[in-house]
Amino acid sequence: KAMHVAQPAVVLASSRGIASFVCEYASPGKATEVRVTVLRQADSQVTEVCAATYMMGNELTFLDDSICTGTSSGNQVNLTIQGLRAMDTGLYICKVELMYPPPYYLGIGNGTQIYVIDPEPCPDSD
């Protein structure tokens, strides 16, 4: 079953390589268990950046070594991706799955283009 997912078209990462965006899904019914996955599409290749499953009303828990953190509020998930560099510029797609209770719903956003600009190295102060 399909579900609409909205996310911003463009986000500029901070000078510290942090990008945040909101992923919002139009839930057809109430879910108690939701999975959010961030996918990166670059050069027609799609790779999984991070994923978290959470109980509604609880915090998202990504793996300890994940570059993602997030919070949820209703049908919105606030995602933050850290440690980004210029080479990580690309389209970041939000995938939302309503896992429990059934039926299963799947929604995939159109993607957020994240631009990352590496900071200029500080000049030597002689």
């Epitope: 429990y100 209770p101 799947l106």
Partner: antibody, heavy 118, light 111 residues
Framework: EVQLVESGGGLVQPGGSLRLSCAAS?????????WSWIRQAPGKGLEWIGD???????YYNPSLKSRVTISRDNSKNTLYLQLNSLRAEDTAVYYC???????????WGQGTLVTVSS | DIQLTQSPSSLSASVGDRVTITCRAP??????????LHWYQQKPGKAPKLLIY???NRATGIPSRFSGSGSGTDFTLTISSLQPEDFATYYC?????????FGQGTKVEIK
């Protein structure tokens, strides 16, 4: 008619790995249902291992999550179960099954027996 | 995890008897008016077979002597008139919350 046939069972050494296959016929595994692996130790009840959704997402029982991988080959219409670091308590008949929209298991394979012993 | 408790664990009955098996959950497995509780029959050496889904709906091809009822935490599988082919083990299963869990089973034996 949906038919599921498991294979790959047999005797495995403790600490080893198993890779089971489940060949589906009469229905495409990408056609909107979810597919599961369930096991049953000799004389015991049923234990859900995990699922692969039609979207390709996988979902595992937390009690086995660190040791299990479920995958599929769409071109062969086949599901796979990989279980690592096997121990005696993994001895069981392993079934694959199809989940309906409300997560009842409406079609089952005949099962394949895995025995973990030295 | 939602641990389902079936009772009795086993029972002896005769052909023609009415048999009732119960399945109890520690919390409700209902959501928006639907019960995520299913029943299976398993015969020795065979895979389980879906009998009843969503607490009260008979699966395709299941005889009308099998019926399911209940909601919330308490569910019942009833065989109105036991037939020789009904001697088997019966399991309930919840799909309300992950991980999916099964009851420990009820073995129906010939008296």
């Amino acid at each position: 008619e949906v038919q599921l046939v498991e294979s790959g069972g047999g005797l495995v050494q403790p600490g080893g790995s198993l890779r089971l296959s489940c060949a589906a016929s009469g229905y495409s595994i990408t056609s909107g249902h979810h597919w599961s692996w369930i096991r049953q130790a000799p004389g015991k009840g049923l234990e859900w291992i995990g699922d692969i959704y039609h979207s390709g997402s996988t979902y595992y029982n937390p009690s086995l999550k660190s040791r299990v991988t479920i995958s599929r080959d769409n071109s062969k219409n086949t599901l796979y179960l990989q279980l690592n670091s096997l121990r005696a308590e993994d001895t069981a008949v392993y079934y694959c099954a199809r989940k309906d929209d409300y997560y009842a298991f409406d079609y089952w394979g005949q099962g394949t027996l895995v025995t973990v012993s030295s | 995890d939602i641990q389902l408790t079936q009772s009795p664990s086993s029972l002896s009955a005769s052909v023609g008897d009415r048999v009732t098996i119960t399945c109890r959950a520690p919390q409700s497995v209902d959501f928006h008016g639907k019960s995520f509780l299913h029943w299976y029959q398993q015969k020795p050496g065979k895979a389980p077979k879906l009998l009843i889904y969503d607490a009260s709906n008979r699966a395709t091809g299941i005889p009308s002597r099998f019926s399911g009822s209940g909601s919330g935490t308490d569910f019942t599988l009833t065989i109105s008139s036991l037939q020789p082919e009904d001697f088997a083990t019966y399991y309930c299963q919840q799909s309300y919350r992950s991980p999916i869990t099964f009851g420990q089973g009820t073995k129906v034996e010939i008296k």
